[in-house]
């Protein structure tokens, strides 16, 4: 079988949801010594980077200027060491937001509920769209989808304190083109004393994989680079939204 290098890891810097006309940055984390990185969009070559000197960095950043619906979609990357190419990375879905209109998000029975109550979010957008998306702050990869003509509902079932947090919704014109975000709705879930102390809370930190972790080579890194990279690929689970 034809020998290939381990696949790189592709990430969006800061977020995979990019407002239209803003610049997106994608990172391709490959290997020290890679002489070329290629970014592919929907299966076609998009951009090329040849780091100099190649042995000093384990990846590159690609920019995508002036984000619009033509540049929203599935990206992947590959890299080359000498004449040997890597496997293709997982696919990264890049979404353009702030298209057209702004939906309205509401919650029933209200933003302050007790643990165990059933809660439903409603997202409304009067312009032509059939798919709606609900995201929780700090959990932007965990997108819930719902369908409706001008409004969609997101039944949460009986909630726990783990549901606490800030929510926004989007209308979607296709899988990769979303509306402006709604104003956030903060859900406050109170529980009894014993439950609250044991209940997992949901801190609103940014998604850990929406960060570019490129490093410059020092000391032992050179010897460990390939092993480390293989281990990262083994443990890295790419989340499709």
């Amino acid at each position: 079988p034809k020998q290939t290098l381990p696949k790189p890891i592709i990430r969006a810097e800061s977020t995979y949801m990019v407002p239209k006309e803003k610049q997106a940055t994608l990172c391709c984390q490959g290997s020290y010594g890679a002489v070329e990185y290629q970014l592919h969009f929907e299966g076609s070559l998009f951009a090329v980077e040849r780091p100099k000197p190649p042995e000093r960095i384990n990846g590159v950043k690609f920019h995508i200027p002036d984000m619009n619906s033509r540049k929203a979609g599935r990206y992947s990357c590959i890299y080359r060491v000498g004449e040997l190419w890597s496997e293709r990375s997982d696919l990264l879905d890049l979404v353009v937001t702030e298209m057209y209109d702004t939906p309205t998000l509401s919650v029933h029975p209200g933003p302050e509920v007790t643990s165990g109550e059933k809660v439903t979010f409603y997202c409304r957008l009067d312009t032509a769209t059939s798919m709606f998306l609900l995201l929780k702050e700090g959990r932007s990869r965990d997108v819930q989808r719902s369908y409706g003509k001008v409004q969609a509902e997101f039944p949460m079932g009986p909630v726990t304190t783990a549901h606490r947090g800030s929510y926004r919704c989007f209308g979607s014109y296709n899988n990769y083109a979303w509306s402006f975000p709604s104003e956030p709705v903060k859900l406050l879930v109170t529980g009894d004393i014993e439950n609250t102390s044991l209940a997992p809370t949901d801190p609103t930190f940014p998604d850990s994989w929406d960060t570019c972790l490129l490093t410059r080579e020092t000391g032992l890194q050179k010897d460990l680079a390939l092993w480390d990279h293989t281990a990262q690929n083994h443990h890295h689970h790419h989340h499709h939204h």
């Epitope: 070559l45 998009f46 951009a47 090329v48 980077e49 040849r50 590159v60 950043k61 995508i64």
Partner: nanobody, 127 residues
Framework: QVQLVESGGGLVQPGGSLRLACAAS????????MGWFRQAPGKEREFVAA????????YYADSVKGRFTISRDNAKNTVYLQMNSLKPEDTAVYYC????????????????????WGQGTLVTVSS
Amino acid sequence: QVQLVESGGGLVQPGGSLRLACAASGRTFSTYAMGWFRQAPGKEREFVAAISRNGGTTYYADSVKGRFTISRDNAKNTVYLQMNSLKPEDTAVYYCAASRPLSNTQVGVASAWYEFWGQGTLVTVSS
């Protein structure tokens, strides 16, 4: 913002040579990666060649590799496309494009990567 103006197009016989130039306005030319694209009648615009902002990285379409050379002179705010061994299938309007990448060594291959475009110059290869 940068304005781009192409020149150097014209009629040339098969096997002949032409040098296209693309002059850019503004003082920040050296911060832009540059590319050449072409569009033949009735066809889609296609990538020809690209050069990084410091000139250290070049990339070519397979169809022109070994015949075309892209270069730049940052002091003159100009990017060039030297076209040798021209063929009838090279007939097209040639466009210059510019974009600001994150590094000195990055180039774009897709038209969507580029932010600014010239109006184009016509190259006709015919006997």
